[in-house]
């Protein structure tokens, strides 16, 4: 069908509450494009009707609410005038009863669910709520160990919980709750957050921390398009450079002629005491020569690599 396949990271989600995923792939989605979502390679798109539990809303796919059976691979097809890209997003839904069990036991939780407060400092936690414009979010309530947080040391400011004079007792399981209104119906959003306490001033000292990748291999089919994010936390006042290298050369220089592998534009999210940086590497077409090579993400003195490997043959197909 002429669409290039791009494989994105997995998303691990909680059942019985709203979830939305935005299909954005700069620079493709910055121009005049149409975005259509499909589920598990279905021939017909995800519903366009806003009253449907799962429907598409412009570039978003919206689940109101997410259900256990919604796990699977969703494709978002981005069609431009002269291009077509199919982005694969693997959604895994788990049953989460946040009062019953520790959120720490869940696999591969993103940075949004694990946050750090700095001992003796004024700090904050962030409630990550990503939804399209058609969703209206009410005020956020915060809980610790299932009890609503009250007290002079805590202030709710938009999506943040400000914590003054952080103490060791502030570690533990938090949750932020908001009421989401869509098309006249109300839904509860509840995000669990595991909070740890650090004594270090600043965010992990002056050495940047590479959250992802983690020196691992990625299975990828020959000929596909692949995007890998490098996520780095660093102090707000840092002067570190972040980049992707191969054979100790910047990827943009190494592939200067073919431009087949490129480094993306760096973005960052600013937190109270640190920044979270993201810079991706895009393989427009994976070739045999890419397998087994360490592609290194550098952030100051920190490094982490990915190695591409061919998927093991699936003998069930024969």
């Amino acid at each position: 069908d002429g669409c290039k396949d791009i494989f994105m990271k997995n998303e691990i989600l909680s059942a019985s509450q709203p979830f939305a995923f935005n299909c954005t792939f700069p620079p493709i989605t910055s121009g005049e494009v149409s975005v259509t979502w499909y589920k598990n390679s279905s021939k017909i798109p995800v519903s366009k009707i806003i009253q449907s539990r799962i429907h598409q809303d412009e570039t978003w796919i919206l689940f109101l609410p997410m259900e256990w059976g919604d796990s699977g691979v969703y494709q978002c097809v981005i069609k431009g005038r002269d291009s077509c890209h199919r982005i694969h997003v693997n959604l895994t839904v788990f049953e989460k009863h946040w009062c019953d069990t520790s959120i720490g036991g869940l696999p591969n939780l993103s940075d949004e669910y694990k946050q750090i407060l700095h001992l003796g400092k004024d700090d904050s936690l962030t409630c990550h709520l990503h939804f399209p414009k058609s969703c209206v979010l009410g005020p956020i309530k915060w809980y610790k160990d299932c009890n609503e947080i009250k007290g002079e040391r805590f202030t709710v400011l938009e999506t943040r919980l400000l914590v003054s004079n952080v103490s060791a007792e502030d570690r533990g399981n938090y949750a932020c709750q908001a009421i989401l209104t869509h098309s006249g119906k109300q839904y509860e959003v509840l995000n669990g957050i595991t909070v740890s306490i650090t004594e270090r001033a600043g965010y992990g000292g002056s050495v940047p921390k590479i959250i992802y990748p983690k020196n691992h291999s990625i299975e990828v089919q020959l000929g596909t398009t692949l995007i890998v994010d490098c996520n780095v936390t660093d102090t707000k006042d840092n002067t570190n450079l972040r980049c992707w290298r191969v054979n100790n050369t910047l990827v943009d220089d190494y592939y200067d002629e073919s431009k087949r592998i490129r480094e993306g534009v760096e973005t960052h999210v600013s937190f109270r005491e640190h920044n979270l940086y993201t810079v991706n590497i895009t393989f427009l077409e994976v070739k045999m020569e890419d397998y087994g090579l360490p592609f290194m993400c550098h952030a100051g003195v920190s490094t982490a690599y990915i190695i591409l490997q061919l998927p093991a043959p699936d003998f069930r197909a024969y």
């Epitope: 017909i44 366009k48 009253q51 539990r53 412009e58 098309s183």
Partner: antibody, heavy 113, light 107 residues
Framework: EVQLVESGGGLVQPGGSLRLSCAAS????????MSWVRQAPGKGLEWVSG????????YYGDFVKGRFTISRDNSKNTLYLQMNSLRGEDTAAYFC??????WGQGTLVTVSS | DIQMTQSPSTLSASEGDRVTITCRAS??????LAWYQQKPGKAPRLLIY???ILGDGVPSRFSGSGSGTEFTLTISSLQPDDFATYYC?????????FGQGTKVEIK
């Protein structure tokens, strides 16, 4: 390929009943809300009724409330419209619709004595 | 219920003309509006949804605009295949309503 095949239309006397069916294939039936839309001869489109993917929510146009019942059997990939107390003004082609995009060919209901 | 008022009810035009059909909602429906094309004896075909997004396989000469209560469907250069009846449709609530239709005929 998506297919929607309506059946059950025909000639019925005023006050009578009919049950329309819409057999669907080519997609995951339970993932989609479905609707019935009708069109009287030479007239415009008129929405009749809608139902959510799991069948839990049903919706009706004012003119059919209490007379028509929409339902679905997700195990059979079939949508139904039970029409009671039929009137002359219910004479129309009835289309089964998935989402906004996919329409059946329609089944003609004629209410006449 | 939300009433949809379409105008004009009939439009005479020639091949190559730029044609505009308007649709007004009795209350705000945000951008939850679709446009359909219907030919005699056939089921309607989706042209535009969410007020301005082109349906699958729909030629780029069709475009939609508007939000709230005022919407337009534009055919930039009328082709022989475009002579048909056009309907607007609001799906802001699941009490759907359609406009009364605009018949585009050959002048």
């Amino acid at each position: 390929e998506v297919q929607l095949v309506e059946s059950g239309g025909g000639l019925v006397q005023p006050g009578g009943s009919l049950r329309l069916s819409c057999a669907a294939s080519g997609f995951t039936f339970s993932d989609y809300a479905m609707s019935w839309v009708r069109q009287a001869p030479g007239k415009g489109l008129e929405w009749v009724s809608g139902i959510s993917g799991n069948g839990g929510d049903t919706y009706y146009g004012d003119f059919v409330k209490g007379r028509f019942t929409i339902s679905r059997d997700n195990s059979k990939n079939t949508l139904y419209l039970q029409m009671n107390s039929l009137r002359g003004e219910d004479t129309a082609a009835y289309f089964c619709v998935i989402d906004l995009d996919y329409w059946g060919q329609g089944t003609l209901v004629t209410v006449s004595s | 219920d939300i009433q949809m008022t379409q105008s004009p009810s009939t439009l005479s035009a020639s091949e190559g003309d730029r044609v505009t059909i308007t649709c007004r909602a009795s209350q705000s429906i945000s951008s939850w509006l679709a446009w359909y094309q219907q030919k005699p004896g056939k089921a309607p075909r989706l042209l535009i949804y969410k007020a301005s997004i082109l349906g699958d396989g729909v030629p780029s000469r069709f475009s939609g605009s508007g939000s709230g209560t005022e919407f337009t469907l534009t055919i930039s250069s009328l082709q022989p295949d475009d002579f048909a009846t056009y309907y607007c449709h609001q799906y802001n609530s699941y009490l759907w309503t359609f406009g009364q239709g605009t018949k585009v005929e050959i002048k």
